[in-house]
Interface confidence: low
């Protein structure tokens, strides 16, 4: 094909007339915007075919692509098509008009696209802007095609200045259609409902815009159809949601609900199922066991935890000695009940820096209109032992006594020991345990009292030593479940004044 003038780009004057000629070895034709404009076709004596396109009274609207192609070009190579681009600078035409579909650009993947805003004059400076922005975007411009690049889902306009007049193009809208491998999730407002309550399920697809939902459910199998509702959640990433709503559930509505989603562009599909249980009435059930006796350590924090299942959500109350507990403003008690799954709850009572007065009988009660459960336990406050007094005396009988007094909860054990070699014991030699009945040289008498108000035990133990012939280190050790305490006294013979 031979085109005269050859181009590939021509700038012609407005209102002028111009002739384009195309010739080839087979019939040829000029095309403009996929149409064949009026033209003169001829065949020369040498067998050459030609077509002459005369452009008269040119205006800016004549700006654009012109193609010369073989008349029967189907199946011919692309080099058998010649392209010519003509500019007709026309100050009365701003941007060339677009078909409506050119203003909406749809994509299914991230790829370069062209915003086809074109002007009649190749000398004009054209800039691209977001519709609501003044800043020019750094995108390359081709006067024959427009702006090409990777664009976000926004609205864009082109701007140019013709003389002293700023001209805006129509707005172009870029839409990225989401088509990806399907990711379906199914949620139920509740997976457990009482008969007469509603069942509401949501099937959500993320990342696709063109999908079809199909639900299967127990009612459908018996021919009772329910019409789902589909809506868009205007969000990123795209969410489409189908809602299946069954009012006034019956026991027969228990079973598996399946949402099947197909996507028509790439023919992907996925399905998810969820089980719904319709119960005759609500329930509350304790899970696991809590011992009837619980312990807390004085001045430490203690959390008491009860796990249970319930539907519908219950009210939870805690009592101490039959009086209702609430979060204390001083922060000594904290109550919390949290939902760890749809029907499973953990209720916690936290005692902060436990006091003796917090010992007592505790009850947790969980209830709703259909059912109730309660759990009770006794809380014992454990108090680390402390030795309050260790004293030595010389009664007239000639024996020597050492008295040890201490307190704690639970009841402390008392251990007496002695060191006869003050230089080496207790570092090198172990102390000797005292108070065993087999030893005649010492006797032990121990009394235990429980103090109700302080809720702790007092131990008073008296050690009688028959004959002390040299200085002796006597140690009293009190022990219970939460600690131990020791004090020591030096016992000297009657006849020996003890000096340090």
């Amino acid at each position: 094909l031979v085109v005269t003038p050859p181009g590939p780009e021509l700038v012609l004057n407005v209102s002028s007339t111009f002739v384009l000629t195309c010739s080839g070895s087979a019939p040829v034709v000029w095309e403009r915007m996929s149409q064949e404009p009026p033209q003169e076709m001829a065949k020369a004596q040498d067998g050459t075919f030609s077509s002459v396109l005369t452009l008269t009274n040119l205006t800016g609207l004549d700006t654009g692509e012109y193609f010369c192609t073989h008349n029967d070009s189907r199946g011919l190579e692309t080099d058998e098509r010649k392209r010519l681009y003509i500019f007709v600078p026309d100050p009365t035409v701003g941007f060339l008009p677009n078909d409506a579909e050119e203003l909406f650009i749809f994509l299914t993947e991230i790829t370069e696209i062209t915003i086809p805003c074109r002007v009649t004059d190749p000398q004009l400076v054209v800039t691209l802007h977001e519709k609501k922005g003044d800043v020019a975007l750094p995108v390359p411009y081709d006067h024959q095609r427009g702006f090409s690049g990777i664009f976000e889902d926004r609205s864009y306009i082109c701007k140019t200045t013709i003389g002293d007049r700023e001209v805006d193009s129509d707005a172009y809208y870029v839409y990225r259609l989401q088509v990806s491998s399907i990711n379906v999730s199914v949620n139920a407002v509740q997976t457990v409902v009482r008969q007469g309550e509603n069942i509401t399920l949501m099937c959500i697809v993320i990342g696709n815009e063109v999908v079809n939902f199909e639900w299967t459910y127990p009612r459908k199998e018996s021919g009772r159809l329910v019409e789902p509702v589909t809506d868009f959640l205007l969000d990123m990433p795209y969410h489409i949601r189908s809602i299946l709503h069954i009012p006034s559930a019956e026991l027969e509505d228990s079973g598996t609900y399946t949402c099947n989603v197909t996507e028509s562009v790439n023919d992907h599909q996925d399905e998810k199922a969820i089980n719904i249980t319709v119960v005759e009435s609500g329930y509350v059930r304790l899970l696991g066991e809590v011992g009837t006796l619980q312990f807390a350590e004085l001045h430490r924090s203690r959390t008491l935890q009860v796990v249970f299942e319930a539907y519908p959500p219950p009210t939870v109350l805690w009592f101490k000695d039959n009086r209702t507990l609430g979060d204390s403003s001083a922060g000594e008690i904290a109550l919390s009940t949290r939902n760890v799954s749809e029907t499973r709850y953990v209720s916690e009572l936290t005692l902060v820096r436990v006091k003796v007065a917090e010992a007592g009988h505790y009850t947790m009660r969980a209830f709703h209109e259909d059912a109730e459960v309660q759990l009770s336990f006794q809380l014992q406050i454990n108090v680390p032992v402390r030795v309050l007094e260790l004293s030595e005396s010389h009664p007239d009988s000639g024996e020597q006594t050492v008295r040890c007094r201490g307190r704690g909860m639970p009841q402390p054990n008392i251990i007496w020991s002695a060191c006869r070699d003050l230089k080496r014991c207790p570092r090198e030699l172990p102390p000797t345990l005292l108070g065993n009945s087999s030893e005649e040289e010492s006797q032990l008498e121990t009394n235990v009292t429980y103090w109700e108000e302080e809720q702790e035990f007092e131990v008073v133990s008296t050690l009688r030593l028959q004959h002390v012939d040299r200085p002796l280190s006597v140690r009293c050790t009190l022990r219970n479940a939460v600690g131990q305490d020791t004090q020591e006294v030096i016992v000297v013979p009657h006849s020996l004044p003890f000096k340090v």
């Epitope: 999730s185 949620n187 139920a188 407002v189 509740q190 997976t191 509401t200 949501m202 959500i204 959640l233 205007l234 969000d235 969410h239 949601r241 519908p312 959500p313 219950p314 009210t315 919390s336 009940t337 949290r338 939902n339 799954s341 749809e342 709850y345």
Partner: nanobody, 123 residues
């Protein structure tokens, strides 16, 4: 039209605290369970905490924030709150409040949600 507007984000040092608020309109707030979710840079949405509607007012938390974050609501003011204590650098994210039908375990529907508030934890 459902509208959720978060506020209270900002820059805080590790170990510090922030309190986020979310004002809701366009739906019956007192009848809706609500959640907080977040999106860290380059990551997907992470559900943090949910609170039920009605008298039970049960709360539930993701392991990553349990014991540090506390969700609460004021139905009279249509406001959802998130008290965040002992903040760590990995808590840096955009935080959104979301209207949730229900969180079944940790499987939540995160939409609709607000525009988000940026929380940056950095020394």
């Amino acid at each position: 039209e459902v509208q959720l507007v978060e506020s209270g984000g900002g820059l805080v040092q590790p170990g510090g605290s922030l309190r986020l608020s979310c004002v809701a309109s366009g739906f019956s707030f007192s009848e809706s369970a609500m959640s907080w979710v977040r999106q860290a840079p380059g990551k997907g949405l992470e559900w943090l905490s949910g609170i039920s509607s009605g008298g039970g007012r049960s709360t539930t938390y993701a392991e990553s924030v349990e014991g540090r974050f506390t969700i609460s609501r004021d139905d009279a003011k249509n406001t959802l709150m998130l008290q965040m204590n002992s903040l760590k650098s990995e808590d840096t994210a955009v935080y959104y409040c979301a209207k949730t039908g229900y969180c079944s375990g940790y499987n939540c529907n995160f939409a609709p949600r607000g525009q988000g508030t940026q929380v940056t934890v950095s020394s």
